[in-house]
Each structure stands twice: as structure tokens, then as C-alpha cells.
């Protein structure tokens, strides 16, 4: 008789794929004309990325550092009207993209939480949560919570409102902190909170250090659902050496939890790479005309259009990974086991019951390395085969689908491999 299938865990929509942050509507759409009506026209692009949620805004009225002139219920007319927002929600729903609204109050000001009037701001947030939940949003994000006095109790209250409306709604909190103890204390009072932080960016970017960061985080947070990013708002290129960009995309998509990206991460967009751009919100490079000020400043391989036509581009890798992440059980909710491999490498397995299993091998080093996989660390339920099929490599030159002998596996500098192998009873 075949062994009984393991019962599937309860899956919320944010467990099923990546979240995509658009913190600046105008920079995302380019040409200084970004609004909600225009964003509706970009939903097909987001669908092509297979992201599950769009983290949008803030969009509300906020006169820099002025509580009285900050209204979390009113959309800033520069972004459009409430009707435009409702239309965007409807269109996103049709494409199965959830919309999460950033309600960080003083987003144009110095202290994002108006340090002197925390209580009245917290009341405004409470009202806004209810208002926008009834409007149909799927969740909220608040950032810089380390600057919010009594953050844990406010977050608990806001999570109660959000979950009280529906268990299917999500609250995301962001912090600049990279301190694991601080992160854990914020998570402890909120069972379903998704927390983005700078935890992973406080790294020496070696295989060993990354492995220890990931395992410490997972151990400290127990069996709760995690999110993975390098910051609460910034671009990957602002935190990573360029040569590790592909490696990190592979890692973020295959760790157990929700990967969270910022617009432009999929094409390697750089903050302030082009003259005159604001550092925090570079213009999204849709095509070569996205930066008309300086002719020739943008080459095709920097743009969405150019990378869409190139199967070896970062964007193509992102789409492939996002696709795998959203459909493979082992990557959706599989168990996670790291094991020993050569110095400079970080290797792990994702597996779920009798489904196809995945092996991830990441070479953070500047030199080619033998994988040196040592399966002795693995539990019996997750043993390694002698061969596994290549799903993808972060570097060109390998044939997808080809079987690779694990004992002889060698990786190029900064190469990451995603391999698959079947469950054997």
C-alpha cells in the first residue's frame, strides 16, 4: 500500500508567492506622470511576474511633518481619486493580484510617525485600517516601526482589527533594524505579522555567514511564517554586490517564507544610477525612452523591454523563479534542511511529502568550487540522490533539464543552482 499523504498546511494567499512593492507610483510609471489610473495599465506586467501581492504607496494626503494636514482616508489628488483606487482594486482582483496599502503616516516628513503625537496618529491609523478594509484592500504595510513608541502593542491592536475583519487580510511591518532580538520581540506579540527588516543585509555576503543568518533567523522565529528581503523598502542593488544579484534572487525565492521585492529588483534597477534621479525612488526603466533627459543613458539590456526579449536576463530568471515558487509544493510549503557543502557555499533542500524535491546550491565565492555536498547532516526523510535534474542556473551555459551528478558537481563563481529530484519511497 502507498504511504498516506501528509496533510497540507493551511495556505494563505501571501504564502503562495512574492510580494512586489511600489513605494513611488510616479517613479514606477516614469515620465513623472504616475497615477492610479496608469498603474492599472501595468497590471499585466505584474501578472507576468507571477507576484501575488502589490504593496502600494503610501498614497494618502500628507503635508510634511504636519499631523493636522495628514489624512489617511484621503488619496492625494496627485495620485488620483478614490474612484481610481476602487477601479484599480477591481482590476487587480480580476488578475488575482492582492493589493496591500502602505499607511505609514508621515511619509513625506522626517519622522514617519510624528514622534510627538503618537497617540493621535495611532487612532488615525486605526480608523484608516477599518476604512480601507471596507474599501476592499487585502492588507496594510507600516514602515519604520522602530520609531513608533510602544510598537508591539500598536501592532497587536492593528493586527486584531485586520484579522478581525478577515483572516485573509495581511499586516506587514517594516523596520530598519537588523538586530535579531529586536525583530523577535516585535514578532512575539503578533502571530501573523509579516516583518521586513535589514536583517539579511547585515552580512559579509559569504556562504557561511548567509547560512548562519538564515538558520539563526528560522530557529529564533520558530515555526512561524517568515518573509525574506534585504530591507523594508530599498532596492536589492543598494545592498548587494552586483555579482550576487542573481544568487540572492534564487535564494529569496527558495527559502521557506514570502519573498518581498521592490519595483525594479527584477531588472537590477539601481538607485541613482542615472543623473538627477532621487536615490530612494529611481525611475523604472520600461524601455530606452524611460529616461529622455539624456539620450543614450539607458541601454536596452537595462530595461524591461530589452530583458523580456533575452532569455538569459535577470528578468527572465525572476519570472522563472517566481513561476516555480508559485506552483511547486516543496517550494510553497516544504520543509527546509541545510547541510554541509564546500567552503563559500550555502546549500539546502526543500521537500514536501511525496512531491518533487528541490536542491539549492549557492556559491557566494569569487572562484569556481566543487560542491562537496555532504548528506550526512540530512534527516532520513530528506536524503540526497546521486543525480538531480537542473531546473536553472543563475549563469548561462548549462542545459536546463540535464541530469547532474551530485558527487561531481562544480559551480562557477557566484553561481546558484536549482535542481530537482523525485521522492523515492
Amino acid at each position: 500500500r502507498a504511504p498516506r499523504c501528509r496533510e497540507l498546511p493551511a495556505q494563505k494567499w501571501w504564502h503562495t508567492g512574492a510580494l512586489y512593492r511600489i513605494g513611488d507610483l510616479q517613479a514606477f510609471q516614469g515620465h513623472g506622470s504616475g497615477n492610479l489610473a496608469g498603474l492599472k495599465g501595468r497590471l499585466d506586467y505584474l501578472s507576468s511576474l507571477k507576484v501575488k501581492g502589490l504593496v502600494l504607496g503610501p498614497l494618502h494626503k500628507n503635508q510634511k511633518d504636519d499631523v493636522a494636514q495628514t489624512d489617511l482616508l484621503q488619496i492625494d489628488p496627485n495620485f488620483g481619486s478614490k474612484e481610481d483606487f476602487d477601479n484599480l482594486l477591481q482590476s487587480a482582483k480580476k488578475k488575482s493580484i492582492r493589493v496591500i496599502l502602505d499607511l505609514t503616516p508621515n511619509y513625506r516628513g522626517e519622522n514617519l510617525w510624528f514622534s510627538t503625537q503618537v497617540d493621535s496618529v495611532a487612532t488615525k491609523v486605526k480608523d484608516a485600517l477599518e476604512f480601507w478594509l471596507q474599501a476592499g484592500v487585502d492588507g496594510f504595510q507600516v514602515r519604520d516601526i522602530e520609531n513608533l513608541k510602544d510598537a508591539s502593542s500598536f501592532l497587536a491592536e492593528w493586527e486584531n482589527i485586520t484579522k478581525g475583519f478577515s483572516e485573509d487580510r495581511l499586516l506587514i511591518a517594516g523596520t530598519n533594524s537588523s538586530d535579531l532580538q529586536q525583530i523577535v520581540s516585535l514578532l512575539e506579540s503578533n502571530k501573523d505579522l509579516l516583518l521586513t527588516s535589514s536583517y539579511l543585509s547585515d552580512s559579509s555576503f559569504t556562504g557561511e555567514h548567509t547560512k548562519s543568518l538564515v538558520t539563526q533567523y528560522l530557529n529564533a522565529t520558530g515555526n512561524r511564517w517568515c518573509s525574506w528581503s534585504l530591507s523594508q523598502a530599498g532596492l536589492l542593488t543598494s545592498f548587494l554586490p552586483a555579482q550576487l544579484l542573481r544568487l540572492y534572487q534564487l535564494m529569496l525565492f527558495t527559502l521557506p517564507g514570502t519573498p518581498v521585492f521592490s519595483y525594479g529588483d527584477e531588472i537590477g534597477l539601481k538607485a541613482a544610477a542615472l543623473p538627477g534621479q532621487p536615490v530612494e525612488a529611481p525611475v523604472m526603466l520600461w524601455d530606452e525612452s524611460s529616461f529622455p533627459d539624456i539620450p543614450g543613458a539607458v541601454s536596452a539590456n537595462m530595461t524591461v523591454k530589452g530583458q523580456s526579449e533575452d532569455p538569459g536576463s535577470l528578468l527572465s530568471l525572476f519570472r522563472q523563479l517566481s513561476d516555480q515558487r508559485s506552483k511547486e509544493r516543496s517550494l510553497l510549503h516544504g520543509d527546509f534542511h541545510t547541510f554541509s557543502s564546500g567552503p563559500g557555499l550555502f546549500s539546502y533542500i526543500r521537500h514536501w511529502d511525496q512531491n518533487e524535491r528541490f536542491l539549492v546550491v549557492l556559491n557566494f565565492g569569487d572562484v569556481g568550487l566543487s560542491a562537496g555536498l555532504q548528506a550526512s547532516d540530512l534527516p532520513a526523510s530528506a536524503s540526497l540522490p546521486t543525480k538531480a535534474d537542473l531546473v536553472l542556473s543563475t549563469q548561462p551555459g548549462r542545459e536546463e533539464g540535464s541530469p547532474l551528478e551530485l558527487e561531481r558537481l562544480k559551480l562557477e563563481p557566484h553561481e546558484g543552482l536549482l535542481l530537482r529530484f523525485p521522492y523515492v519511497a
Epitope: L73, K126, D127, L129, E130, F131, Q134, A135
Partner: nanobody, 125 residues
Amino acid sequence: QVQLVESGGGLVQAGGSLRLSCAASGRTFSRYGMGWFRQAPGKEREFVATISCSGTSTYYADSLKGRFTISRDNAKNTVYLQMNSLKPEDTAVYFCAADTRHCMGYTKDGGYAYWGQGTQVTVSS
């Protein structure tokens, strides 16, 4: 059970002002989101304004912003609608409503559990 009674309606000339009041029964008034809606002859009921439990947050129909102001006095269990620069198209029956589930009432009338009988506002040109 919450009972709501509107008052303050009447006949006014275009450009004039009116202040509507809505008195609520019950000791938990400060825990309701409150809203005003209106219904013109032959038309559907439409949203006017809403105010949160504490009165901290307000929200208005786009077309009325700047002319109408919603406020509340929790000590008196009353919510108000100050209407300035009235126009003939503001002629309607004005209803007040209580949302007992949410502190922040909403723009759709489905969320409101309790309604008043309405007060007639007529603006002549």
C-alpha cells in the same frame, strides 16, 4: 438596539446654510462609526460623509468636500452635518446611520446596521 432621530431639515434658499443633528439612544455611542446619507426624489440613496468613533477621522463624498462638515459630540450622543453654500441639487431626504461593527463608518450603506427616519432638506433657487 440603537435609535436615531434626525432634526434640522427645512426649506432654505440657494447659498444658505443648515445644520442637521442626529441624536442617538444608547450608552455606547462613542463606539459607533456614524454616517450621513441622502436620497433625492427618484434617485438611489447616496453617501454624504462619515466620522470615526472618536471624531478624529472624517471622510466626505468627493462632490461635497469643502461645503459640508461632519462632527460629533460623544457627551451628547449626537452627530452633526453642517451644510454651507447649499445648491438646489442638495435637495433630498438626509439620513443618519450608525455602524456598530466598525469605528470608521464607510461610504457604502450596507455596513450600517441602524438608520434614522430621515429629515427633508429643500433648497430653492
